[in-house]
């Protein structure tokens, strides 16, 4: 059962796992949610009746029954983790805490103009978990405007104390706001020989990398595969760090793999969701329950539905035994990972999918695409929407992309002459325009947010957000696309598609079925040569075949240029402008979305 409200002046008795310090009860709830075992918590607020050394303590708790006895206590605030909830969860915390000193290991001290600058510095520093900034009113003259970057083993403060005229806050890496590079490569036959901060068992290097990503101190990792010569180290995932933030030594070793934390690109890559099955593999751990199940998929469902289950091993039924049902062993451990991994015993193992909601919905795998042809099939581009105007008569106006449950990203030039959002309708999950009838459900538009530097498509800033009146319930046919990661600026996308209901040639009409075309990206230098009369800026991205023939056209505007990278689709461009359609040596020009990620997040995450 999902309980989101906080219980004031209430303390949960017993069940303590560990105590951390958090600046608020709200953040204590987030910490509890991300902790592998925490189901409930008690936070102590500052209060004259409470010992100051207990202020800001967040006691993480567990219970077999999923609840604990309640006791009345002034200044105590208790609640439940969001593990029990189905809604999307985020660790992003933009709050600034006034007059609080969040203590940790200060490793960088420098002058900053503002708390915002200090927070940005923290967000763009690989080691930083949180910061404290002494404001202009701080009593000690020499310490005014000092920005202290801090880290701890847990990512949370080691203590929090009241201190006038300072502010504290957290790194915004988990809000997708970091400019740090995102290195997704996994290096085979490589060992990073730096200090280990922790070690866990993992079935493969991908899971090891994901564990590293959500471990607060891990910057890179080394994984020893099941073929590693030293038996005691097989399936061992070593979580590592270094002062420079990069591995100091790389050693060539067969059967080992190494890689980096994906912290700065975690909003566009699954980090918590380990969805694969591992055949002929047994996960050992504390046994929670043993239940009969028809298949390993059914066993995974049982694990996902049991809030305390972290991973499972399924033993298929022996022929004609137990109505063909196998045994499903639901398991847990102190850190969420198996305590040991064994091979060759016939089990099929995997992890709970309960944590998938901690990942961005946009990272969910969608159905395989149809190769060849130009017409799309249902569910192939579930982020694509058709934006209609109802004035003077209803018609398709532009394309757009779902980027959040209340947000559509499109082009600014679509709204030339649009006086009010009231005349707009957004249809999602549509394949054919002919499906749209009088009674077809749509999303009304609450607000049109056009980039304030937009003048005309050709001069850039051709980007707009639509805030919907109601939220989109994600399904297979309507779900978001990931924004590109700022750390992915140097990625070369090779699998890019433009989609829309636009014209197929310059003088044509809106198409009934959603069209798709695979189009290669063109460098900005090359693009500039093709458009000598225009300035192709770094905020634009171009795509097209030299010989022409495939391109976006009238009516595709605002729609996505979608590129697949590491199995995840990213919204790389917004269809903006071009000379004619599909002309030779005239590539299409798109808004370069990565350059607007800050703008998008600022507008969509505004309180």
């Amino acid at each position: 059962e999902c309980v989101t409200q906080l219980l004031k002046d209430t303390c949960f008795e017993g069940g303590d796992i560990t105590t951390v310090f958090t600046p608020s009860a709200k953040y204590c709830q987030v910490v509890c949610t991300y902790h592998p075992r925490c189901l409930l918590f008690t936070f102590t607020a500052e209060s004259p009746s409470e010992d100051p050394t207990r202020w800001f303590t967040c006691v993480l708790k567990d219970s077999v029954t999923e609840t604990l006895p309640r006791v009345n206590r002034t200044a105590a605030i208790s609640g439940y983790s969001f593990k029990q909830c189905s809604h999307q969860i985020s660790a992003c915390n933009k709050d600034i805490y006034v007059d609080l000193d969040m203590k940790g290991i200060n490793y960088n001290s420098s002058v900053a103009k503002s708390a915002q600058e200090c927070q940005e510095r923290c967000t763009d520093d690989v080691h930083c978990h949180f910061f404290t900034y002494a404001t202009r009113q701080f009593p000690s003259l020499e310490h005014r405007n000092i920005c202290l970057l801090k880290h701890t083993q847990t990512g949370t403060p080691t203590r929090i104390t009241k201190l006038d005229k300072v502010v504290s806050g957290f790194s915004l890496k988990s809000c997708a706001l970091s400019n740090l590079a995102c290195i997704r490569d996994i290096f085979p036959n490589t060992v990073f020989a730096d200090s280990n901060i922790d070690s866990v068992m993992a079935p493969d290097a991908f899971v090891c990398g994901r564990i590293c990503t959500h471990h607060p101190g891990c910057l890179f990792f080394t994984f020893f595969s099941q073929e590693w010569p030293k038996e005691s180290q097989r399936n061992l995932c070593l979580l590592k760090t270094s002062e420079s933030g990069l591995p100091s030594t790389r050693i060539k070793k067969s059967k080992a793999l190494s890689g980096f934390s994906l912290q700065s690109c975690r909003h566009s890559i699954p980090v918590f969701c380990h969805s694969s099955f591992y055949h002929d593999t047994d996960f050992l751990g504390e046994e929670l329950d043993i239940v009969a199940a028809k298949s390993h998929e059914a066993c995974q469902k049982l694990c996902t539905n049991a809030v305390r289950c972290q991973f499972f091993t399924y033993t298929p039924a022996q022929a004609s035994c137990n109505e063909g049902k196998g045994k499903c062993y639901l398991k847990l451990s102190s850190n969420g990972s198996p305590t040991k991994i064994l091979h060759g015993r016939g089990g099929i193992s995997g992890y709970t999918l309960r944590l998938c909601k901690m990942d961005n919905e946009c990272t969910t795998k969608i159905k395989p695409r149809i190769v060849g042809g130009t017409a799309s099939v249902r569910g192939e581009w579930p982020w694509q929407v058709t934006l209609h105007t109802t004035s003077p008569t209803q018609r398709h106006l532009c394309g757009g992309s779902i980027i959040g449950n209340q947000w559509i990203l499109t082009a600014a030039h679509c709204f030339y002459g649009v006086e009010s959002p009231k005349i707009l309708r957004v249809y999602s999950g549509i394949l054919n325009q002919s499906e749209i009838k009088e009674d077809t459900s749509f999303f009304g538009v609450q607000e049109i947010i056009i980039h304030d530097q937009y003048k005309m498509a050709e001069s850039g800033y051709d980007i707009a957000l639509l805030k919907l009146e109601t939220t989109v319930n994600y399904t297979d046919s309507q779900r978001p696309i990931c924004l590109p990661s700022k750390g992915d600026r140097n990625v070369i996308y090779t699998d890019c598609w433009v989609t829309g209901w636009g014209y197929r040639k310059l003088r044509d009409k809106i198409q009934n079925t959603l069209q798709k075309a695979k189009i290669p990206l063109v460098t900005n230098e090359e693009c500039q040569k093709r458009y000598r009369g225009h300035k192709i800026t770094h905020k634009m991205i171009c795509a097209g075949y030299r010989e022409g023939g495939k391109d976006a056209c009238k009516g595709d505007s605002g729609g996505p240029l979608s590129c697949k990278h590491n199995e995840v689709w990213h919204l790389v461009g917004i269809t903006s402008w071009g000379e004619g359609c599909a002309q030779r040596e005239r590539p299409g020009v798109y808004t370069n979305v990565v350059e607007y990620v800050d703008w998008i997040l600022e507008k969509t995450q505004a309180v």
């Epitope: 490793y107 000690s140 003259l141 310490h143």
Partner: antibody
């Protein structure tokens, strides 16, 4: 845990120079300022100077011309150099860690005799 | 430079007494004053910073108050282990400076 340890020559002849090292552990010098304070026998505390996390320095006005503070972040060491020593520089020399201008951790001190 | 003056070099007290030590700054130092305790043969120990904030682990019988130029350090109920020298220090502006110290001794 946080520790600071001073090491010095113990005895120095008048007009000679002094070099004291403060070696720290449990924290990083890039994130904290370090102070030097001295205490002549039977007397009070005298603030000598400091080096900030970012390397800036501040000195006691009366001693500025004779003092120099530097550090090596990678070795976690802070250095106090003082020249033209006189007998009234005889004191116990302490290094201490900065917490918003106050000194939250102190070393045990090293005794210097100028004679 | 800012001069800190502790008017009493010595103060006599008994266990259980309330005692207050004063410190005066030669110019306004806002609330940037710290208090230290030093016992014979030991390094000074930070008790109070920014006038009234107690350092970690410091008993609540130690308090500080004041602002501008006049500051007071109070022990609400003196314990035998509190007999020591107490120094004030301004940390408003470098060069930072200490008061001359007040020795708290048994009556």
């Amino acid at each position: 845990q946080v520790q600071l340890e001073e090491s010095g020559p113990g005895l120095v002849a008048p007009s000679q120079s002094l070099s004291i090292t403060c070696t720290v552990s449990g924290f990083s010098l890039t994130g904290y300022g370090i102070y030097w304070v001295r205490q002549p026998p039977g007397k009070g505390l005298e603030w000598l100077g400091m080096i900030w996390g970012d390397g800036r320095t501040d000195y006691n006005s009366a001693l500025k011309s004779r003092l120099s503070i530097s550090k090596d972040n990678s070795k976690s060491q802070v250095f106090l150099k003082m020249n033209s020593l006189q007998t009234d520089d005889t004191a116990r020399y302490y290094c201490a860690r900065d917490y918003y201008g106050s000194k939250d951790y102190w070393g045990q001190g090293t005794t210097l005799t100028v004679s | 430079d800012i001069v800190m003056t502790q008017s009493h070099k010595f103060m006599s007290t008994s266990v259980g007494d309330r005692v207050s030590i004063t410190c005066k700054a030669s110019q306004d130092v806002s609330t940037a004053v710290a208090w230290y305790q030093q016992k014979p043969g030991q390094s000074p120990k930070l008790l109070i910073y920014l006038t009234s904030y107690r350092n970690t682990g410091v008993p609540d019988r130690f308090t500080g108050s004041g602002s501008g130029t006049d500051f007071t350090f109070t022990i609400s109920s003196v314990q035998a282990e509190d007999l020591a020298v107490y120094y004030c220090q301004q940390h408003y502006k470098t060069p930072y400076s200490f008061g001359g110290g007040t020795k708290l001794e048994r009556l």
